[in-house]
C-alpha cells in the first residue's frame, strides 16, 4: 500500500499535477522519512541552482536529482551532471542555460539512491522562479532647478521586469518606495537642495513575461544633493 | 542597454514588396525569440510573425505566404520579408525580444510600445 503526501508550495501547475511523494508504509523503514524540499531558482536565465536541506537527513546522505520538461520535447529524464555540495555531501545541482526551458514545466525529482523507493518529485514553473542580477549603471540627472530623473540598466529583456526605487536623505530614518514599470525611469519632482539624498533600486521578473515574487539584489547606491551636486549640478553618478 | 532598432519601412504600391530589419543589441539575440508585430492608427498591436532560437516559425493567417521572417545571428539582426502587399498591411511595424520559449509555450498579449520606435509601412492602392 502507498501513501501520497500532496506538498504544494505554490509554485504548483494547479490545473495538472501537485507535487507527489510517494512513500511506502514499511514500519519505521527509512523510506518514511520524507525527503527535503527542493528550491530553484533561474538567476538571470543564465543558470538555475536547485538546492535542498542536506543537514535535514538523519545521517549524511548523497541524494541525487534528476529532471525532465512535462509534457514536451524535453520529457527525457536527465541526470544532474553538476552536483553543489555543503560539507561533502550533495545538496544542490546547477542547469545551465541550454537546460533551462522557462516556459515548459519543470519536473524535478530528489531520490535516495540507497532506497530508491524513497523519492519525492515536484513541477516548477520556472518563469516564476526567475531572479534578475541587480540594476547597474545608475545616473542621476537634473531636469529642473527641483526635479531629478533617476535611470539605470538591467542586464535583462526591460519589459520582462518592473523595479523598485528607494530612496532618503540624510535626516531621514527609513526609505521611501516607488514601484516602476518596465520603462526603468524614475523622477524624483521637489528635491531639497540642502539635504543629500540616496537612491537604489532592484527589479524583478514580473509581470509580462512571468510572475516571480523574488527581487533582485539593490543595485549600488547612488547620492545627490549638498557636498555633491556642486560637482556637476547637471550630471552625477557616484556609486558608494 | 537592451536595443531594438527597425528600418526597412516606406511607401509602396499594392503589389509591391518591403524587407524590414531589426538590429538588437544588450542581449544575448541567439538565445531569445524574436518577432514583428504591427499597429494600425485605432488598432490594437497585431502579433505578425515570430522565430524562435531554434528556428520555429510562426505567422498570423492573413500575411500567411506572403511574409517571411528570417534571422542573422552574426548580425544580431531579425528580418521580415514582405511580398504582395496590401493597404491593410498599413501600419507600424515594431520589432520585439522575448525569453527563449516565450511564443511556442507561453504567450500574452503585447503592447507594441514595449520595444522600439518601429517603422512605418504605407501601402497605397
Known amino acids: 500500500l502507498n501513501t501520497t503526501i500532496l506538498t504544494p508550495n505554490g509554485n504548483e501547475d494547479t490545473t495538472a499535477d501537485f507535487f507527489l511523494t510517494t512513500m511506502p508504509t514499511d514500519s519505521l523503514s527509512v523510506s518514511t522519512l520524507p525527503l527535503p524540499e527542493v528550491q530553484c531558482f533561474v538567476f538571470n536565465v543564465e543558470y538555475m541552482n536547485c538546492t535542498w536541506n542536506s543537514s535535514s537527513e538523519p545521517q549524511p546522505t548523497n541524494l541525487t536529482l534528476h529532471y525532465w520538461y512535462k509534457n514536451s520535447d524535453n520529457d527525457k529524464v536527465q541526470k544532474c551532471s553538476h552536483y553543489l555540495f555543503s560539507e561533502e555531501i550533495t545538496s544542490g545541482c546547477q542547469l545551465q542555460k541550454k537546460e533551462i526551458h522557462l516556459y515548459q514545466t519543470f519536473v524535478v525529482q530528489l531520490q535516495d539512491p540507497r532506497e530508491p523507493r524513497r523519492q519525492a518529485t515536484q513541477m516548477l514553473k520556472l518563469q516564476n522562479l526567475v531572479i534578475p542580477w541587480a540594476p547597474e549603471n545608475l545616473t542621476l540627472h537634473k531636469l529642473s532647478e527641483s526635479q531629478l530623473e533617476l535611470n539605470w540598466n538591467n542586464r535583462f529583456l526591460n519589459h520582462c521586469l518592473e523595479h523598485l526605487v528607494q530612496y532618503r536623505t540624510d535626516w531621514d530614518h527609513s526609505w521611501t518606495e516607488q514601484s516602476v514599470d518596465y520603462r526603468h525611469k524614475f523622477s524624483l519632482p521637489s528635491v531639497d537642495g540642502q539635504k543629500r539624498y540616496t537612491f537604489r533600486v532592484r527589479s524583478r521578473f514580473n509581470p509580462l513575461c512571468g510572475s516571480a515574487q523574488h527581487w533582485s539584489e539593490w543595485s549600488h547606491p547612488i547620492h545627490w544633493g549638498s557636498n555633491t551636486s556642486k560637482e556637476n549640478p547637471f550630471l552625477f553618478a557616484l556609486e558608494a | 542597454q537592451v536595443q531594438l532598432q527597425e528600418s526597412g519601412g516606406g511607401s509602396v504600391q499594392a503589389g509591391g514588396s518591403l524587407r524590414l530589419s531589426c538590429t538588437a543589441s544588450g542581449f544575448t539575440f541567439d538565445d531569445s525569440d524574436m518577432g514583428w508585430y504591427r499597429q494600425a492608427p485605432g488598432n490594437e498591436c497585431e502579433l505578425v510573425s515570430t522565430?524562435?532560437?531554434?528556428?520555429?516559425?510562426y505567422y498570423t493567417d492573413s500575411v500567411k505566404g506572403r511574409f517571411t521572417i528570417s534571422q542573422d545571428n552574426a548580425k544580431n539582426t531579425v528580418y521580415l520579408q514582405m511580398n504582395s502587399l496590401g493597404p491593410e498591411d498599413t501600419a507600424v511595424y515594431y520589432c520585439?525580444?522575448?525569453?527563449?520559449?516565450?511564443?511556442?509555450?507561453?504567450?500574452?498579449?503585447?503592447?507594441?510600445?514595449?520595444w522600439g520606435q518601429g517603422t512605418q509601412v504605407t501601402v497605397s492602392s
Open positions: 522565430i524562435s532560437s531554434d528556428g520555429n516559425t
Open positions: 520585439a525580444a522575448e525569453p527563449r520559449g516565450y511564443y511556442s509555450n507561453y504567450g500574452g498579449r503585447r503592447e507594441c510600445n514595449y
